[in-house]
């Protein structure tokens, strides 16, 4: 038994930030369990990682040097990446795992977000726009 | 009280194998990895590998990768780590310990050692 | 891999001294290190993990600081249980890796 995954198939971060909500057919509450999002068509990079138990309060962690938060629904998984760069444009993919209780579950490989990472461009300012051309 | 207890002190010729448990108790055997360690004599701790119980994935260090097998039984919540084609340089202590499957940040609990010695 | 060097290899020092050990990862693991402590015969026992939360259960006197390649271990008053040898290991990627250990002897 596998549980199903619903992610945005593409996000834009102009701020170089941006919210990627990791949606599951499985109800989180009162289970023990490991959210992440991993970077790449290989899945290569654990970007975050988000823990979470009956007793305790959440934990998120990236071992990665991401900026990352994660938010918890009953059914969903939000994680907040901060201080993108251009060049971590890529596919990323949510994971989820149940630890407890028994059995062990996890999700079918989901489609994946495309995050497109926009660059801060600085733009003239329209009250000193730059030398007219002759 | 949680605990990781391992089998006794095995003495093996070269080119043979052996195996040690590492039995756990007192925790949910699913929410952590284990891993084992190893330590030759007046030695360095050497990391094989680890193997987590709820989906028996395994990583290797790339040293051990053809010789080295781990295995868990969780009725039992106990694991194993099996040597293969054994040499005098793989006598040691062999540790088990774990970390959290969830934060996987350190070795809080370990195993009390069991004396490998590989001699013809 | 991550290779982790730790220095000095040995030391001699009193009680009541201050000790610092010091352990060098060839790459950044920002804060991905723990300390442990091994007594001859016996298995290590975590003192530090993620570089400087002191474990449960381990006094105050053991302390860790640094982030990325260089950490350091601090022991602010050697006490006479405190003679062992201590390893750093960094968990930030796989495999694994423990720096070649520290010896505390009596001075």
């Known amino acids: 038994n596998k549980i199903l995954v619903k992610q945005s198939p593409m996000l834009v971060a102009y701020d170089n930030a941006v919210n990627l909500s990791c949606k599951y057919s499985y109800n989180l509450f009162s289970r023990e369990f490991r959210a992440s999002l991993h970077k790449g068509l290989d899945s290569a990079v654990e970007v975050c990682v988000v823990y979470g138990n009956y007793s305790q309060q959440l934990q998120v962690y990236s071992k990665t040097g991401f900026n990352c938060d994660g938010k918890l629904g009953n059914e969903s998984v939000t994680f907040y990446l901060q201080n993108l760069y251009v060049n971590q444009t890529d596919i990323y993919f949510c994971k989820i795992e149940v630890m407890y209780p028994p059995p062990y579950l996890d999700n079918e490989k989901s489609n994946g977000t495309i995050i497109h990472v926009k660059g801060k461009h600085l733009c003239p300012s329209p009250l000193f726009p730059g030398p007219s051309k002759p | 009280q949680v605990q990781l207890v391992q089998s006794g002190a095995e003495v093996k010729k070269p080119g043979a194998s052996v195996k040690v448990s590492c039995k756990a108790s007192g925790y949910t055997f699913t929410s952590y990895y284990i891993h084992w360690v190893r330590q030759a004599p007046g030695q360095g701790l050497e990391w094989i590998g680890c193997?987590?119980?709820?989906?028996?994935?395994?990583n290797y260090n790339e040293k051990f990768k053809d010789r080295a097998t781990l295995t868990v039984d969780t009725s039992i919540s106990t694991a194993y780590m099996e040597l293969s084609r054994l040499r005098s340089d793989d006598t040691a202590v062999y540790f088990c310990?774990?970390?959290?499957?969830?934060?996987?940040?350190?070795?809080?609990?370990w195993g009390q050692g069991t004396t490998v010695t590989v001699s013809s | 891999d991550i290779q982790m060097t730790q220095s000095p290899s040995s030391l001699s020092a009193s009680v009541g001294d201050r000790v610092t050990i010091t352990c060098h990862a060839s790459?950044?693991?920002?804060?991905?290190l723990n300390w442990y402590q091994q007594k001859p015969g016996k298995a290590p026992k975590l003192l530090i993990y993620?570089?400087?939360n002191l474990h449960t259960g381990v006094p105050s006197r053991f302390s860790g600081s640094g982030s990325g390649t260089d950490f350091t271990l601090t022991i602010s008053s050697l006490q006479p249980e405190d003679f062992a040898t201590y390893y750093c290991q960094q968990c930030q990627t796989y495999p694994y890796t423990f720096g070649g250990g520290t010896k505390v002897e009596i001075k």
């Open positions: 790459q950044n693991i920002y804060v991905w």
């Open positions: 993620k570089a400087s």
């Open positions: 310990t774990r970390s959290h499957y969830g934060l996987d940040w350190n070795f809080d609990v």
């Open positions: 193997i987590y119980p709820g989906n028996v994935n395994t």
